[in-house]
Every structure is written in structure tokens, then in C-alpha cells.
């Protein structure tokens, strides 16, 4: 069983999860119209189900295109300082949380980046939810 | 870094068919739109054809229309331009461009070497 | 398809120069217009993008401007690297990419 020492562990790695995707979402939020407009022309997958922590696999799967896409949009002669530190910190995150089991991602649909972002925030949203109460 | 490398040109017979090909690296390939432009010998730079990220959309430019395919291979992470019924004003440069997009507005942000394509009879 | 105008077609400057490059769009294109330089033998380089956007690497004697249908390209002080032709070229009439004929910067 859980310890209270390994629940709150996992708790703190989710709310840091949850800020460095908020941090991203804004990021892209506050582009200016043509480079959002380009911005959402890309494609992310989004996987069938994201119910549980092991399904985390997914959203790292997908962190490489994520960062190619933020820092184009960035511009490529500002460092992308923000960007590269927030993708290393969910990298970071997700390994811890994602645990040593493997799991194989189904991927249903592709969706945009902010979608992309907003369902990542929604699946961590609710398993801090779950776990506090 | 990344690279895009045309191959396949080369001398052809009016009517006869050709076709390029383009490998990609240093990108996640599968998230972005990819070009054909060419140009003319001292000529300047004409749009070709495009296609979408996963292959779902293509476009041409009038000229071509019916007669050069734009394709891909996202496992392969290469790109294709098959040319049929070629003509003497197909004879180009033809470059394999990439667009910060997946689909829609964008402009060329890396381009290849291109490779050259001679319609002679 | 829009037209893009590019003229004068060839240009002569001396180096340290300050050189506008203008570009005309037949109609409205927004801020949807990018810059190559091409010099012989070789594959354009990506300049500007969105009207004054710099691309990667480029240094900053390099300034687009504009919006609409009047747009320019701007070299501050002009270097013996600099002497080429360039392009301006419109992505709003999706996917009617169309490009001007093309600038040459020679040298005076």
C-alpha cells in the first residue's frame, strides 16, 4: 500500500506537472495571431483513454514534437529558454510518475495543441482531485 | 540539424515520367507540411505542389495540376514527387522545402540542396 | 492568383550602403510575406517571415517591413556577403504560393 510519504510525493509531482503544462498552455495563449494560426495546424496525438498515471507514456511520446513546435513558434533566435525548461521538467515529472511498468499508447484522434495541453491539465486536475479526497 | 536531401533528377524525354524523392532528418517529419518549389534555368522561383502533414491534403500549382503527384512516407520519413507526361518547361531545379506547419499558412523555413530535371528530347 | 511585384528587377549599391528592397502584393495579404536571399548555384536561404520576422541566424542588418500590399526589405549597411538576388514571396492565398520575379543586388 501507499505510504502518506509516497502520496504526497506523487501529489507534489503532479501539482508540478500541472504548472509546467499551464506554463506551456499560456505560453501558446499569448502568441500573436499568424504564429497561432500556424501553430494549430500541427497535430498532436491524444490516446484513447487518460485515466491513470501509467498513461502519462503518452503524453511523453509526444513531448519531442512538442517542443519542435513551441520553440518554432518561439522564434528560433530567442533561446526558448521558458519552453526547454518546462518540457525537461515534465520529462523529469512524468518518468517518476509514470512508474516502470511499459504501457502501449492507442492513440484515438489528433487534436491541437491546445487541446493538446487543456486534456493533459484536465487528467492531472483530476487525479489530484481524486487523490485529495 | 535539419536536412533535406533530393534525389532522382535527371535527364528525361518529353511524355516520359520521373520521380523525386526527398529524405528528411533532424525533425519529427510526420507534423509537417512539404513542398516542391522549383526554378527554371536564370528563371525565378515557382511553388510546385504541397501536402499536408499526414498526406490527407494535396495542392498544386495549375501547371502541374493532373500531372505531378506529391506524396509521402511518414515511417520512411521521406517525401516523393512522381512527374508524368513531362514536358521541355518542367526542365528545373527542383527543392524539397519544409513549412513551419502542418497544414495551411506557412512559409519555407529549410530547404534542400535540389536536384536538377532536364526534359530534352 | 495574386501577383507579387518586385522592381526594380536588379539593384546596384556599394558596400556599407543602406538598400530597401520593395515587394508589392496585387491585393491584401496581411503580414503573410517572407524574404530569401539566393545566391548562384545554391538553394534560397530563408530571411524574414510574417512581414518582420527574423529568421534563424540571420543577422540584424536585416529588417522587413510592412503590411497590406506594400512591403520591403531593408539591409542597414550593406556587406560583400549581401550581394545576391532576392525574393519575396506571399503564403496567404493558400495554397496559391506565389513568389516576386526577384531582386538582384549588385555590386557599384
Known amino acids: 500500500a501507499p505510504t502518506s510519504s509516497s502520496t504526497k510525493e506523487t501529489q507534489e509531482q503532479l501539482d508540478q506537472l500541472l504548472l509546467d503544462l499551464q506554463v506551456l498552455l499560456k505560453g501558446v495563449n499569448d502568441y500573436k495571431n499568424s504564429k497561432l494560426s500556424r501553430m494549430l495546424t500541427f497535430k498532436f496525438y491524444m490516446p484513447k483513454k487518460v485515466t491513470e498515471l501509467k498513461h502519462l507514456q503518452c503524453l511523453e511520446e509526444e513531448l519531442k514534437p512538442l517542443e519542435e513546435v513551441l520553440n518554432l513558434a518561439q522564434g528560433k533566435n530567442s533561446h526558448g529558454g521558458n519552453t526547454r525548461e518546462s518540457i525537461s521538467n515534465i520529462n523529469v515529472t512524468v518518468l517518476k510518475l509514470k512508474g516502470s511498468e511499459t504501457f502501449m499508447c492507442e492513440y484515438d484522434e489528433t487534436v491541437t495543441i491546445v487541446e493538446f495541453l487543456n486534456r493533459w491539465i484536465t487528467f492531472c486536475q483530476s487525479i489530484i482531485s481524486a487523490s485529495s479526497s | 540539424q535539419v536536412q533535406l536531401v533530393e534525389s532522382g533528377g535527371g535527364l528525361v524525354k518529353p511524355g516520359r515520367s520521373l520521380r523525386l524523392s526527398c529524405a528528411a532528418s533532424g525533425f519529427t517529419f510526420n507534423r509537417y507540411a512539404m513542398s516542391w518549389v522549383r526554378q527554371a534555368p536564370g528563371k525565378g522561383l515557382e511553388w510546385v505542389a504541397m501536402?499536408?502533414?499526414?498526406?490527407?491534403?494535396?495542392y498544386y500549382t495549375d501547371s502541374v495540376s493532373g500531372r505531378f503527384t506529391i506524396s509521402r512516407d511518414n515511417s520512411k520519413t521521406t517525401l516523393f514527387l512522381q512527374m508524368d507526361s513531362l514536358r521541355t518547361e518542367d526542365t528545373a531545379v527542383y527543392y524539397c522545402v519544409r513549412s513551419p506547419a502542418g497544414d495551411w499558412v506557412a512559409y519555407f523555413d529549410y530547404w534542400g540542396q535540389g536536384t536538377l530535371v532536364t526534359v530534352s528530347s | 492568383d495574386i501577383q507579387m511585384t518586385q522592381s526594380p528587377s536588379s539593384l546596384s549599391a556599394s558596400i556599407g550602403d543602406r538598400v530597401t528592397i520593395p515587394c508589392q502584393a496585387s491585393?491584401?495579404?496581411?503580414?503573410?510575406l517572407s524574404w530569401y536571399q539566393q545566391k548562384p548555384g545554391k538553394a534560397p536561404k530563408p530571411l524574414i517571415f510574417?512581414?518582420?520576422d527574423l529568421e534563424t541566424g540571420v543577422p540584424s542588418r536585416f529588417s522587413g517591413s510592412g503590411s497590406g500590399t506594400d512591403f520591403a526589405l531593408t539591409i542597414s549597411s550593406l556587406r560583400p556577403d549581401d550581394f545576391a538576388t532576392y525574393y519575396c514571396?506571399?503564403?496567404?492565398?493558400?495554397?496559391?504560393?506565389?513568389f516576386g520575379h526577384g531582386t538582384k543586388l549588385e555590386i557599384k
Open positions: 501536402i499536408s502533414f499526414d498526406g490527407g491534403n494535396q
Open positions: 514571396h506571399q503564403y496567404h492565398d493558400y495554397p496559391s504560393y506565389t
Open positions: 491585393e491584401d495579404i496581411s503580414n503573410h
Open positions: 510574417d512581414a518582420s
